[in-house]
Amino acid sequence: KKEDGESTAPTPRPKVLRCKCHHHCPEDSVNNICSTDGYCFTMIEEDDSGLPVVTSGCLGLEGSDFQCRDTPIPHQRRSIECCTERNECNKDLHPTLPPLKNRDFVDGPIHHR
């Protein structure tokens, strides 16, 4: 996972990276494989009904440093992990939802699971 302290000017890769994509496959993907000059990612977030949804795919080099930084968003439970070390490396990423804060129970809707 990329850490906050990493450089904000990512170095261009000399070669294309292939990633698994799920719920996030661009038009130029084939057999749930996309290609990128940036990073592979896996993300988990809550949908409108509070259920966890996992998506994965490719992030282009432009702006991916920011997207991979996983900055907390108020009132949104979401976690993203990025990788570049090998093709389809995001198959092995398993981000987890950040824990619920107390006020989330108060502010948010009540879900029965």
């Epitope: 000399p14 292939r18 130029d28 490719c58 282009g60 090998r86």
Partner: antibody, heavy 116, light 112 residues
Framework: QVQLQQPGAELVKPGASVKLSCKAS????????MQWVKQRPGQGLEWIGE????????LYNQKFKGKATLTVDTSSSTAYMQLSSLTSEDSAVYYC?????????WGLGTTLTVSS | DVVMTQTPLSLPVSLGDQASIFCRSS???????????LHWYLQKPGQSPKLLIY???NRFSGVPDRFSGSGSGTDFTLKISRVEAEDLGVYFC?????????FGSGTKLEIK
Amino acid sequence: QVQLQQPGAELVKPGASVKLSCKASGYTFTSYWMQWVKQRPGQGLEWIGEIDPSDNYTLYNQKFKGKATLTVDTSSSTAYMQLSSLTSEDSAVYYCARFGYYVDYWGLGTTLTVSS
Amino acid sequence: DVVMTQTPLSLPVSLGDQASIFCRSSQSLVHSTGNTYLHWYLQKPGQSPKLLIYKVSNRFSGVPDRFSGSGSGTDFTLKISRVEAEDLGVYFCSQSTHVPFTFGSGTKLEIK
């Protein structure tokens, strides 16, 4: 300078298999994909597939799945393509080519002749 | 598969003339990263192809500035401003946006 060395010619009998080689030099072998391209006279260029030497990850043109198998030996910076169950349709020039986001260097090609 | 249609098939020119070769793809070559992976190669008789232009308009190292590439989406052009004898051969366009990667059928540049 970047060089991709391929044997000039191979003669094989129908039904047999052949393993074509491509020795890379002048760059870090694992930093680029290696592609293979087929060229028959009057038939243009056909992309067979590619392999990433850093993790042996392969992508094939559906048309060549079962026909071509791509491998690498990183210790000798050599890429290989095995072609099986050869027929006269496989007679062609086969190029290896270095690929990052586009092919920038090509080997000189191996002329494969399938004949009894 | 993306079909790359090249025109003309043959282009007779006089030395010093300008030459234009066209390439049309059956679908857009704009990649999801925003890049357009359309490239041009020259193959001389008995040789392997050599890269001239990558990503539509970027000249590869050592390629003379009389070669230029342009276009977007599905329509692309290679221009040679003043044809020299060493430019004769077969020109191919190629796309690496969509797998499987595909090539144009080639344009043979020859002397009139």
